[in-house]
């Protein structure tokens, strides 16, 4: 994908420096598996520079290829509490809106562990809303160094 | 954060290409939980381009948002060796100096596993020193494909 | 590494926007531990922009430092299926060709878990072919949100 002459002459920021790192705000009500996120310097080290939050879900504002990363740690976790995973507790990151673009991007199960962490490159479009669904009955830690979710625009 | 006109006209490198990938040098004495890192082409595939090492700890030389990543594998590891520890072996990456900015950025426990790996975006400032603390009595592998720690400047 | 005056004046793309995200195509025959990858919009959300595939292995076309990331999930997995293996199922990412540059870059064992995920920064050169070797008798999931492999050029 060639950059247009106009793009070449714009400041780098206009090519897309969109980036966000979020911390867990809360979980949804019992029938809602989504995690609800928050970001901003007043909250600690989380931030939103380009993307925005819509009712705790991350919305993309610029087309491009993004690096999406996430870490989720279970709040109470030990060898005894991990045995409480039935159909193993699973975390899925996906595009949940618009419905026409709904897809799972990243999926991990906790199995015997207490933390999942991963990352991937994926094309995202302006207006895509990312949801992070945690299935099961165990709660994610709200400690900001244990549970976080972020995206980084890497190229058009 | 807008780029200044001067920044727009400077070579890209001046915007910050700071990057480092380190390999484990050694662990600290018994009361020091820190891992000590080393980097440089003579050592293999590790390198420092911008950040620097201060007594085995990584010091940031340019303000910005960084992607911090780490993988640590325990040297002698099985489900029994990790599960026999009451306080699970834990790895924490944080700013340890200056003291006024001390904070834990990333924390993972090994639980039933032998490797932890994660990454996150975080704002770092010139002079921040990152420490990686491994608590517990198990030793990390020094194999360069099993244990490594790196940072990448991604935007101002 | 200073950028040359010519580089400073070329469009950004010429500095290297090389990037790829691949999905699993198939595993090799019994004596071949390599995973075979595929990429392209017709397949889903995978893509190759710069790097290329050579018989299912990823070949680099531009020198630079790359962020390499991978996630592999075992297809049929439980704590019993992973723990019953004497030699833990292991995933290694390395340069497999040219032979003179052969090296393991990233290695993880599944132990009690069903997914491994990690990432690292590493220098790669034009012509380097990356292989991902999965040892053991367990099969990787071909679900595109569970198993993927990618590289991103980050600086010269």
């Amino acid at each position: 994908q060639r950059l247009s002459r106009a793009q070449q002459q714009l400041p780098l920021e206009s090519l897309g420096w969109d980036i966000a790192e979020l911390q867990l705000n809360h979980t949804g009500p019992q029938q809602d598996p989504r995690l609800y996120w928050q970001g901003g310097p007043a909250l600690g080290r989380s931030f939103l520079r380009g993307p925005e939050l819509d009712k705790g879900q991350l919305r993309i504002r610029r087309d491009g290829i993004y690096m999406v990363h996430i870490q989720v740690t279970l709040a109470i976790c030990s060898s005894t509490s991990t045995s409480r995973h039935h159909h193993p507790t699973t975390l899925a990151v996906g595009i949940c809106s618009p419905a026409s673009r709904s897809i799972s991007l990243l999926r991990l199960s906790f199995h015997q562990g207490c933390t999942i962490a991963s990352q991937r490159l994926t094309p995202l479009a302006r207006g895509d809303t990312l949801c992070t669904n945690l299935t099961g009955t165990l709660l994610p830690s709200r400690n900001t160094d244990e549970t976080f979710f972020g995206v980084q625009w890497v190229r058009p | 954060q807008r780029l200044s006109r001067a920044q727009q006209q400077l070579p890209l490198e001046s915007l910050g290409w700071d990057i480092a990938e380190l390999q484990l040098n050694h662990t600290g004495p018994q009361q020091d939980p820190r891992l000590y890192w080393q980097g440089g082409p003579a050592l293999g595939r590790s390198f420092l381009r911008g950040p620097e090492l201060d007594k085995g700890q990584l010091r940031i030389r340019r303000d910005g948002i960084y992607m911090v990543h780490i993988q640590v594998t325990l040297a002698i590891c099985s489900s029994t060796s990790t599960s026999r520890h009451h306080h699970p072996t834990t790895l924490a990456v944080g700013i340890c100096s200056p003291a006024s900015r001390s904070i834990s950025l990333l924390r993972l426990s090994f639980h039933q596993g032998c490797t932890i790996a994660s990454q996150r975006l975080t704002p770092l400032a010139r002079g921040d020193t990152l420490c990686t603390n491994l608590t517990g009595t198990l030793l990390p592998s020094r194999n360069t494909d099993e244990t490594f720690f790196g940072v990448q400047w991604v935007r101002p | 590494q200073r950028l040359s005056r010519a580089q400073q004046q070329l469009p950004l793309e010429s500095l290297g926007w090389d990037i790829a995200e691949l999905q699993l195509n198939h595993t090799g025959p019994q004596q071949d531990p390599r995973l075979y990858w595929q990429g392209g919009p017709a397949l889903g959300r995978s893509f190759l922009r710069g790097p290329e595939l050579d018989k299912g292995q990823l070949r680099i076309r531009r020198d630079g430092i790359y962020m390499v990331h991978i996630q592999v999930t075992l297809a049929i997995c439980s704590s019993t299926s992973t723990s019953r293996h004497h030699h833990p199922t292991t995933l290694a990412v390395g340069i497999c060709s040219p032979a003179s540059r052969s090296i393991s870059l990233l290695r993880l064992s599944f132990h009690q878990g069903c997914t491994i995920a990690s990432q690292r920064l590493t220098p790669l050169a034009r012509g380097d072919t990356l292989c991902t070797n999965l040892t053991g008798t367990l099969l990787p999931s071909r679900n595109t949100d569970e198993t993927f492999f990618g590289v991103q050029w980050v600086r010269p």
Epitope: I76, S83, T137, E146 | - | -
Partner: antibody
Framework: QVQLVQSGAEVKKPGASVKVSCKAS????????MNWVRQAPGQGLKWMGW????????TYADAFKGRVTMTRDTSISTAYMELSRLRSDDTAVYYC???????????WGQGTTVTVSS | DIVMTQSPDSLAVSLGERATINCRAS??????????MHWYQQKPGQPPKLLIY???NLESGVPDRFSGSGSGTDFTLTISSLQAEDVAVYYC?????????FGQGTKVEIK
Amino acid sequence: QVQLVQSGAEVKKPGASVKVSCKASGYTFTNYGMNWVRQAPGQGLKWMGWINTYTGEPTYADAFKGRVTMTRDTSISTAYMELSRLRSDDTAVYYCARDYGDYGMDYWGQGTTVTVSS
Amino acid sequence: DIVMTQSPDSLAVSLGERATINCRASKSVSTSGYSFMHWYQQKPGQPPKLLIYLASNLESGVPDRFSGSGSGTDFTLTISSLQAEDVAVYYCQHSREVPWTFGQGTKVEIK
């Protein structure tokens, strides 16, 4: 709707064993664990342990280890609690309670009275 | 084991008045942004019923006159306006670590 139906009252002699069943309906049995809680006459509640109904792995309270066995039969969505070497102070109502993970025990069986008497 | 101590052991309150039950844990049951404390109601001849989970969340179908508060080691169950059907024994229970333990119970009666 979610229901946990337990087996009927039992009278046992000291030294004998008792096996109480808990049949679940109205939800996917293997998605939730099952706790066992007992209540002696006029006393409070005491947690005995629980079973992961998916894997069959039990976790027992120390006070009952060696005497209690928790099992399940997924084909009939039923959990079992067997207590051996019964003593008179094991006389109690035994409850099964669905484990809703970190959210507590959200549904309870009606209770099974076990009387240990010579 | 974490010991849960409720106070008072029994409580007599007039209809329409507030009832407050306290529960103290021998060590903190809060971690990672949550308090792993739950409250149950048990009426005579019936099994316990979950009222409040995670210290302050009302279980579905429970009247909103019930509320929970607290963190760390000290927790409170409040019935804002006691009704006749609230006569029961109330138990606190933690799920911070194995073994889960219950308080000894607080009997609520009408004055």
